[in-house]
């Protein structure tokens, strides 16, 4: 014969467990009601009375069915390098994530503990691996025939424009300058294309990869008054 539905509090059968959204109270030795998210146990159950729940106070929360005596405190306000992607409510903690241009250098269970600014690749280098929510940008030298003249966390090395007649050859940090006739990229006929001015900072000789087993000798040779900035040359 099926048992009648038991109402909390009730004594579980020997070796039995309490039902969903109930817990076993060791003191009362009874199955008692849990409190819903956003509430906590104000008064614990006895053999004759069920759990009394109360709403969480401001800046505190419970996310799960529970029987905690006090709600959890919401995390501190998001720092200036973070954005609040989830507000503190009675049912959920505040979640802070890194703002655009930053990544999480030290994560916590939810959100981020410490944000750091994404690395910017300097002229002569382009982005090899973009930054993600949890990893920094990686830069690589611009290969022969490509350049980057920016300091950027997103720019990759771009091909030099192809000139019919080259006025100034391109390098890793500067585009080629064309003269006489137009370059392959659309330009006004007969125009001299001058690349955007860029400081000599961080220019380097065109990198040539060394053999993967044993990189060959590479030198940094001065160019003009100052040496190239990030010279990478090989055999």
């Amino acid at each position: 014969e099926p048992r009648a539905v038991a109402f909390t509090p009730y004594a579980p059968e020997p070796g039995g467990t309490c039902r969903l959204r109930e817990y076993y109270d060791q003191t009362a030795q009874m199955c008692c009601s849990k409190c819903p998210p956003g509430q906590h146990a104000k008064v614990f159950c006895t053999k004759t009375s069920d759990t009394v729940c109360d709403s969480c106070e401001d800046s505190t929360y419970t996310q799960l069915w529970n029987w905690v005596p006090e709600c959890l405190s919401c995390g501190s306000r998001c720092s200036s390098d973070q954005v609040e992607t989830q507000a503190c409510t009675r049912e959920q903690n505040r979640i802070c994530t890194c703002r655009p241009g930053w990544y999480c250098a030290l994560s916590k269970q939810e959100g981020c503990r410490l944000c750091a600014q994404l690395r910017k690749c300097r002229p002569g280098f382009g982005v090899a691996r973009p930054g993600t929510e949890t990893s920094d940008v990686v830069c690589k030298p611009c290969a022969p025939g490509t350049f980057s003249n920016t300091t950027s966390s997103t720019d990759i090395c771009r091909p030099h424009q192809i000139c019919h007649v080259v006025a100034i050859p391109g390098n890793a940090s500067m585009d080629a300058v064309c003269t006489s006739t137009s370059p392959t990229r659309s330009m006004a006929p007969g125009a001299v294309h001058l690349p955007q001015p860029v400081s000599t900072r961080s220019q380097h000789t065109q990198p040539t990869p060394a053999p993967s087993t044993a990189p060959g000798t590479s030198f940094l040779l001065p160019v003009g008054p100052s040496p190239p900035a990030e010279g990478s040359t090989g055999d």
Epitope: R119, K120, F125, A128, C139, S218, A229, G231, S232, T233
Partner: antibody, heavy 125, light 107 residues
Framework: QVQLQQSGPGLVKPSQTLSLTCAIS??????????WNWIRQSPSRGLEWLGR?????????DYTVSVKSRITINPDTSKNQFSLQLNSVTPEDTAVYYC???????????????WGQGTLVTVSS | DIQMTQSPSSLSASVGDRVTITCQAS??????LNWYQQKPGKAPKLLIY???NLETGVPSRFSGSGSGTDFTFTINSLQPEDFATYFC?????????FGQGTRLEIK
């Protein structure tokens, strides 16, 4: 935690080759985000950067001009280490030699964050 | 090569003092400058990167500032463990170069 363990002789005769090795644990010599450097320190010259090797789809080497004709830095992927060879040494090359990991090559936030313990190399007959 | 000139080359101070070290680059290096601490018989240790950013785990009494050619490194309220040699290092251009060091001694 990255650790760099240096090994190699502490005494080299003039005109011979100085050879040091730096074994890496906690990172990979072929990591696409690190670079592997040799730096030396002497009372007369202070801290002096010698060169580096790093991998970004291909291997790259950079060396300082003052030792360009005598230096080779090689990675050894099978042993996860890298080495320094400095040929034709003179007493001027006597120094404490350090290997160091560099984070951020080619970008902002470019620094030496892990160092080997240092090896005093004396060049003397 | 870019020359890095540190001053003073040595200084004496007491626990609790505030000390300042300067580093001057021979040409504009933007903020591509790091500061290291070295104790006798040990390798240098990174303290500050990109002129003013504190490396993780480094006490907040250490700070850095500056841009272009002139940079400053400050220790507020010196602790006994801070007596060491400090170096600046630029990475704007290869070869990477260091300052000659500032030795901080107990007065």
């Amino acid at each position: 935690q990255v650790q760099l363990q240096q090994s190699g002789p502490g005494l080299v005769k003039p005109s011979q080759t100085l050879s040091l090795t730096c074994a890496i644990s906690g990172d990979s010599v072929s990591s696409d985000s690190s670079a592997w450097n040799w730096i030396r320190q002497s009372p007369s010259r202070g801290l002096e950067w010698l060169g580096r090797t790093y991998y970004r789809s291909k291997w790259y080497n950079d060396y300082t001009v003052s030792v360009k004709s005598r230096i080779t830095i090689n990675p050894d992927t099978s042993k996860n280490q890298f080495s320094l060879q400095l040929n034709s040494v003179t007493p001027e090359d006597t120094a404490v030699y350090y290997c160091a990991r560099e984070d951020g090559v080619g970008g902002t936030k470019d620094y030496f964050d892990y160092w080997g313990q240092g090896t005093l190399v004396t060049v003397s007959s | 090569d870019i020359q890095m000139t540190q001053s003073p080359s040595s200084l004496s101070a007491s626990v609790g003092d505030r000390v300042t070290i300067t580093c001057q680059a021979s040409q504009d290096i933007s903020n591509y400058l790091n500061w290291y601490q070295q104790k006798p018989g040990k390798a240098p240790k990174l303290l500050i990167y990109d002129a003013s950013n504190l490396e993780t785990g480094v006490p907040s009494r250490f700070s850095g500032s500056g841009s272009g050619t002139d940079f400053t490194f400050t220790i507020n309220s010196l602790q006994p463990e801070d007596f060491a040699t400090y170096f600046c290092q630029q990475y704007d251009n290869l070869p990477i170069t260091f300052g000659q060091g500032t030795r901080l001694e107990i007065k």
